[in-house]
């Protein structure tokens, strides 16, 4: 029985060239979190945080992705191409799979209004 819910940072905006934290939080379940996957809009994996193995950042993103804080993910040196959907997938036992969605909009430096709660200056 999947009783949990995922809270995310929702729709966020960040400045081109800057950084942003993607954050999800699983609540309302006692399930064990064994792994968290971070994926981009085109289904490509950015990073995995495994309970035993720790973080694995996929090679294509090594230069621009930093693990954390917590189970979150920090995207650096943002480009306009980073605009789009990001998904956190929590693999848990005994519940199974929970998925959260974040929409990131990367704005030109001159336009950026920093609405993101987890924004890094």
């Amino acid at each position: 029985m999947m009783t949990g819910t995922i809270e995310t940072t929702g729709n966020i905006s960040a400045k081109k060239g800057g950084s942003v934290i993607l954050q999800c939080h699983l609540s309302s379940t006692m399930a064990q979190v064994t792994q968290v996957n971070w994926e981009q809009h085109d289904h490509s994996l950015l990073a995995i945080r495994n309970a035993e193995l720790g973080w694995h950042i996929y090679p294509a993103f090594k230069d621009r992705v930093a693990p954390g804080p917590g189970l979150g993910l920090t995207l650096q040196s943002l480009t306009m191409n980073d605009t789009g959907e990001y998904f956190c997938t929590y693999h848990t036992y005994p519940d199974g799979t929970y998925r959260g969605r974040i929409f990131l909009e990367v704005l030109e430096s001159s336009v950026a209004e920093h609405s993101a709660r987890f924004q890094i200056p």
């Epitope: 064994t34 996957n37 994996l45 035993e52 193995l53 519940d95 799979t97 998925r99």
Partner: antibody
């Protein structure tokens, strides 16, 4: 080349025990969660058990909980399934399978080892 | 447990044809369905995962679609080596469960 080779199957009486092994090669065994899946004589597939990469987490289907134990020895690149209190409905071909690194499905399977529970 | 109903259980087709196999889950499994191919004397092969993502090394004539409760495996322009048994499996919640299988034979 990724290879998974099961062994240890055989004929056993109801209530008996058996220990299956699966020897892995061609990949970093300690980086992957592993599963046992069985196929009944009627060709139905059933997920049996799973173990995390380091062995800290083990999961079972309800029908085998308390009777089967999944374990692994990462130094020996080997996965195990210890089966006790065997029943006729446990008769099946038992396969070990590697879980994808991202946990989406099982990307490599062994050839299987046959277990028959009969008096 | 999530029940998976796979149809048809048997399918006869000719090389070059396009076929579809369906799987229906007893409740929503989001996009988390995998498809496998089973052939005698060979190890089971993962074809598709997460509903529509093609496993590395699998020919593009295999495709998957669907989300929620209804999923489809399509094999376009059948090759002789495609005649085999096919199974779907949900990887959304424990225990992982499989469909009953589809035997694809040459007409």
């Amino acid at each position: 080349e990724v290879q998974l080779v099961e062994s240890g199957g055989g004929l056993v009486k109801p209530g008996g025990s058996l220990k299956l092994s699966c020897t892995a090669s061609g990949f970093t065994f300690s980086s992957y969660a592993m599963s046992w899946v069985r196929q009944s004589p009627e060709k139905r597939l059933e997920w049996v058990a799973e173990i995390s990469s380091g062995g800290s987490y083990t999961y079972y289907t309800d029908t085998v909980t308390g009777r089967f134990t999944i374990s692994r020895d990462n130094a020996k690149n080997t996965l195990y399934l210890e089966m006790s209190s065997l029943r006729s409905e446990d008769t099946a071909m038992y396969y070990c399978a590697r879980k994808r690194r991202d946990y989406y499905g099982m990307d490599y399977w062994g050839q299987g080892t046959s277990v028959t529970v009969s008096s | 447990d999530v029940q998976i109903t796979q149809s048809p259980s048997y399918l006869a087709a000719s090389p070059g044809e396009t076929i579809t196999i369906n799987c229906r889950a007893s409740k929503s499994i989001s996009k988390y369905l995998a498809w496998y191919q089973e052939k005698p004397g060979k190890t089971n092969k993962l074809l598709i995962y997460s509903g529509s993502t093609l496993q590395t090394g699998i020919p593009s004539r295999f495709s998957g679609s669907g989300s929620g409760t209804d999923f489809t495996l399509t094999i376009s322009s059948l090759e002789p080596e495609d005649f085999a048994m096919y199974y779907c499996q949900q990887h959304n919640e424990y225990p992982w469960t499989f469909g009953g299988g589809t035997k694809l034979e040459i007409k």
